[in-house]
Every structure is written in C-alpha cells, then in structure tokens.
C-alpha cells in the first residue's frame, strides 16, 4: 500500500554522525611536490578500516595517489589537489583527521619565506570549506513528481565561514528566475523550490567558497510529469483458469490509472444462441462493481465460490476512468469432480468441458 | 485560492456508519493525497489514514483498519472517509488534509500536511 | 512505529521566547513537521523539514532536529501565539503519519 507515484516515501538511512574535527591541520604545498598526510589512530588504538576523502569525494588509489590506512601521499602535486582531505572511518563515516590542503603555483623550498609565513598566516584555526555530510550528498539525481518541494543542501564547514552559491545550468539562480520563487537558506546551506514545474528541470550547482578555497555540488532535477491516460492493466491478468466442480476460482485484475478508476467484472453471456447484439456489441452480465464499501482492492479480485458448469465461459475485467476504457479477459472451464471422470472412462467416452 | 471544504456536523448512534465528504479547490487535485486526522474533545490529534488521488490506493493507521474506508472521486475533486460501527469513544472532529511530497537531497522524501479541511464533529450518541 | 514526546503545556512570558520539544528515538534521522493549532480552529502547518517556514509564517518562528530532539522556537511571543503546537513526522517503515501528544502554549 502506498501513495502512489506522487506520494511515495524514500526513507533514510541512520546516521552515526561524528564529531566536528577539533583540530583541522592547514598545509602549504608547492606545485610539484609530493603531498603526505598521516593520521594516527586515536589514543594508539586500533582504528579499524578508514577512507581518505577529498572535497567530499572518495579517493581511488592511482600510481599518483597513494592510499594507506594511516597515510595519504599525493605524488607531483598540482593546484586541482588543492582542498579539504579527511581520513574516516569507513564505517561511521566519523572525521578521524581533517587537514586543509593548498597547493600553489610555485614550487616550494626550504627558504622560501613566503610561503613559510604565508603557512604561519593561516594558523590551525582556519581552512578552505569541506562537507560536513558528504555521506549524504550522493543522490545526484532527483527525481520528484509536479507539485511537490524540493530542497537541495550543501552542508559545509570551514573557517572563516564559507558562502554559498547557486547555479542553474551553470548560470546564477535567483528568485526571480522562477515563477514562485526560491527560499535561501544560508545558514542551513539550502535552496527550497515550493511546487515545482516541469520548467524547474534542469542542473542545481552549490558553490561553498572562502578565501582558503571552493567546494560545489551540483544535483540533477527531474520533474515528473504525469499524462493522462485510460486505465493500464497488467498483461496477464486475468489469466485463463481451469477448476473442478464445486470448488472456488479466483480472477485477477491490476489496474493502474492516473484519475481514480471505476472497476467492473463482466460475463458474456448468450441471448437467444448469439453472444453479440446486432450493433456487435457483447451481450454481458455485470458481476461486480463498486458499491458503498468496496474497495479498489477489493474490485481487483473477483471470486467464484462452489462454481458449477454454467460458470464457464469468458470474463472480463473492464477499467475506465475520465479518459477512457480498458478490459482484459479470462476463460474458465469447468472440470467434472474426480468420481464422474472415472466413471466416464470407465464407460470408455471421454468428456470434454 | 487551495481550499478544502468538509460536509456538516453529523449526529449518528453507537453501531452506524458515517460518510464526511471534503471537496477539494484551487488546485489540481490528482496531485496530493488526502490525509484524514481526527480530535476527539480535549485530545490531540490522531493520523486515520489516507489515499492516493493518483490511483486511489490507500493506507489506514492500525487502530482503524477494517472500520475506516478512504475513497476519492476524482470527477468531483472530493475525498471521502467512512467509519463503520460507530462507538462512543468516534465522538471528535474529523479533519481532511492535502499531503504534499517535501524532497530533501540530504534526507529523502517526507509527507506533510499543508492544507486543511474546516473539520467536521461528528457525535455518538444513543 | 516512531513515537513522539511533547510536554503537555509551557508558560511565556509576552516578548520572551518559546522553545516546544518533540522528542522521540533518532529524531534526527527523520525529517519534522509542525502544526499550531487555535482554539476552535483547524491546524495550520508552520514549519516543514525541520527548519523551513512556509510563506506567511513570521520569522520569529524557527526550528531545529538534532539526535533525539526536534525543537521550534518562536522569539518575542505574542498573545497570538496561544495555541496548541503538534510534531508530526512520517513513518517510512510503515507508511503512515505519527503526532505528538501536543503541546499548549499559554502567553502569560
């Protein structure tokens, strides 16, 4: 049971969350230099398996990345390296070491002054912008259904506090780029679209900058449109059935239908040896229909108790809406009990139902 | 303007049926679902069930299951909720409410309540 | 089933400010709605995912979910913030809606 394709939940995974990082390491590289960053477990204790992250982003192992449990080198750096490394527990997805990372053009030296005090300038307390929940920030693409609010977020962190940004299609994003507007939240690093359209499609950037650096996101929206349509039954249902006398039968029917479908279960019948009326039309019984207290679920089934040989024949599940209409249909034969077969083979003729 | 508009009070005896309509406007209807909430005098508010107006499919709360029916028709914009063998303890404020989807890119689809129908009492009573 | 704790009544002085709880295990995990409610009236939803106002809804009133505890807080309380606040939040194992008990919010 559920709301539909409009009004369906996707739950969210638990979340152990970690600390903030207390201590955030700043690092000056200079281009071309090999990056090394070690983290240490904790109190000396075992630190179980760990991920290094970039930016938010995973880091693969490469012949310039080399990746340790404790230790992360980045051989023959370049200004793309530079941004916010963690080590994480793969596990809890806790900030075990947070290091700010800046690479910059020139090639670093012993006695390179400005780069020593360009270092000493940043202090521990400062760094470029990072993601404080990038373990939730991998559903890129959203697909919602027209009408509904869609909230993208960027949570991030760093010191001074980064600002945040919004693209559309790599342009800025303003309210009045949209009919209804767009709530900012800066402080819970959100954009907010009430009702959305099917103008709202398109690429959502978040760009999270200070003067140490710049982080962006970009998610993908699809905005679901719905088109109107007769009832959609699934293919083979009902399906054709064989009983024994006297026993019960049941018969299936899914439907699916945008505007609320009216559900009937027809019999063909014969009137006067024809099953057609003169227009072509099939001469029918209706078995059932929505009353009072029945259900789509229930319409969905049609049960045939103690059935005798004059319920065989052909039934038809007919389902319209504002649209139209759609049927599907069954046969049901209708089998003698188990003594009568044996006494007809005995007899040595063989019935047919 | 979104509006929802409930049917009146309704005065029934321990053992009926009572059907509340609420008549959707100022939107497209097929677009929401219906939640039903009741209060009963004094109390807080207590979640029925609700319906799908895009396919009619439905889903009641524990409590109500097999007493409460939730139907749309969706030619009149209108929601329905009826609740069989009406006891003492029904006696509350019915209230239709229009679902909307809230997506969040960090934690995923929620339901909320974002318009409401003007209520309707309904009192058992023998 | 998730189930939600709100105290049943909180006391504010007019100009002070106003701090509703609803808690309930990993509240955080979930995504909170909440509702006032006026004498009389039909509940009027006030804040959604947490922390988002919807139009018409004054800035006084903001929100927060962390852990076990949602919170809404509305700063410099006016009279016309006497009302019953409801957390909702929406059970995704089961598909359903749950409330909290309700809190009454009395403007001394």
């Known amino acids: 049971e559920s709301l539909g394709t409009e009004q369906r939940v996707v739950g969210r995974a638990a979340e152990v969350p970690g600390p903030e990082p207390g201590q955030q390491e700043q690092l000056v590289f200079g281009s071309g230099d090999a990056v090394e960053l070690s983290c240490p477990p904790p109190g000396g204790g075992p630190m179980g398996p760990t991920v290094w992250v970039k930016d938010g982003t995973g880091l693969v192992p490469s012949e310039r990345v080399l990746v340790g449990p404790q230790r992360l080198q980045v051989l023959n750096a370049s200004h793309e390296d530079s941004g916010a490394y963690s080590c994480r527990q793969r596990l809890t997805q806790r900030v075990l070491c947070h290091f700010s990372v800046r690479v910059t053009d020139a090639p670093s030296s012993g006695d390179d002054e400005d780069g020593e005090d360009e270092a000493e300038d940043t202090g521990v307390d400062t760094g470029a912008p990072y993601w404080t929940r990038p373990e939730r920030m991998d559903k890129k693409l959203l697909a919602v259904p027209a009408a509904n609010t869609v909230r993208f977020r960027c949570p991030a962190a760093g010191n001074p506090t980064p600002s945040i940004s919004w693209l559309k299609n790599g342009r800025e994003f303003r309210g009045e780029h949209r009919i209804g507007g767009i709530k900012l939240r800066h402080q819970q690093w959100s954009l907010v679209m009430e009702s959305v359209v099917p103008s709202d499609r398109g690429n959502y950037t978040c760009v999270v900058e200070n003067k140490f650096g710049s982080i962006r996101q970009t998610y993908t929206l699809d905005v679901l449109e719905r088109s109107p349509h007769r009832p959609i039954l699934q293919a083979g249902l009902p399906a054709n059935q064989t009983a024994v006398l006297g026993s019960d039968v049941e018969f299936h029917c899914k439907v699916y239908s945008d505007a609320q479908p009216h559900i009937q279960w027809l019999k063909h019948v014969e009137v006067n040896g024809s099953k057609v009326g003169p227009d072509g039309t099939p001469y029918v019984t209706v078995l059932k229909t929505a009353g009072a207290n029945t259900t789509d679920k229930e319409l969905e089934v049609l049960s045939l108790h103690n059935v005798t040989f004059e319920d065989a024949g052909e039934y038809t599940c007919l389902a319209g809406n504002s649209i139209g209409f759609s049927h599907h249909s069954a046969w049901l034969v209708v089998l003698p009990a188990e003594e009568e077969l044996v006494e007809a083979d005995e007899a040595g003729s063989v019935y047919a139902g | 303007e979104v509006q929802l508009v409930q049917s009146g009070a309704e005065v029934k005896k321990p053992g009926a049926s009572v059907k509340v309509s609420c008549k959707a406007s100022?939107?497209?209807?097929?677009?929401?679902?219906i939640s039903w909430v009741r209060q009963a005098p004094g109390q807080g508010l207590e979640w029925m069930g609700w319906?799908?107006?895009?396919?009619?499919?439905?889903n009641y709360a524990q409590k109500f299951q097999g007493r409460v029916t939730v139907t749309t028709d969706t030619s009149t914009s209108t929601a329905y909720m009826e609740l069989r063998s009406l006891r003492s303890e029904d006696t509350a404020v019915y209230y239709c409410?229009?679902?909307?989807?809230?997506?969040?890119?960090?934690?995923?689809?929620?339901?909320?309540?974002?318009?409401w129908g003007q209520g309707t009492t309904v009192t058992v009573s023998s | 089933q998730s189930v939600l704790t709100q105290p049943p009544s909180l006391s504010v002085a007019p100009g002070k400010t106003a701090t509703f709880t609803c808690g309930g295990n990993n509240i955080g995990d979930k995504s909170v709605h909440w509702y006032r409610q006026k004498p009389g009236q039909a509940p009027v939803l006030v804040m959604y995912l947490d922390t988002e106002r919807p139009s018409g809804i004054p800035e006084r009133m903001s929100g927060s979910n962390f852990g076990n505890t949602a919170t809404l807080t509305i700063t410099r309380v006016e009279a016309e913030d006497e009302a019953d606040y409801y957390c909702?939040?929406?059970?995704?194992?089961?598909?359903?809606?749950?409330f909290g008990g309700g809190t009454k919010l009395t403007v001394l």
């Open positions: 100022g939107y497209m209807f097929t677009s929401y679902g």
């Open positions: 909702q939040v929406w059970d995704s194992g089961s598909d359903h809606v749950v």
């Open positions: 409410a229009r679902v909307l989807g809230y997506y969040d890119s960090i934690d995923g689809y929620y339901y909320g309540m974002d318009v």
């Open positions: 319906v799908s107006t895009y396919n009619g499919d439905t």
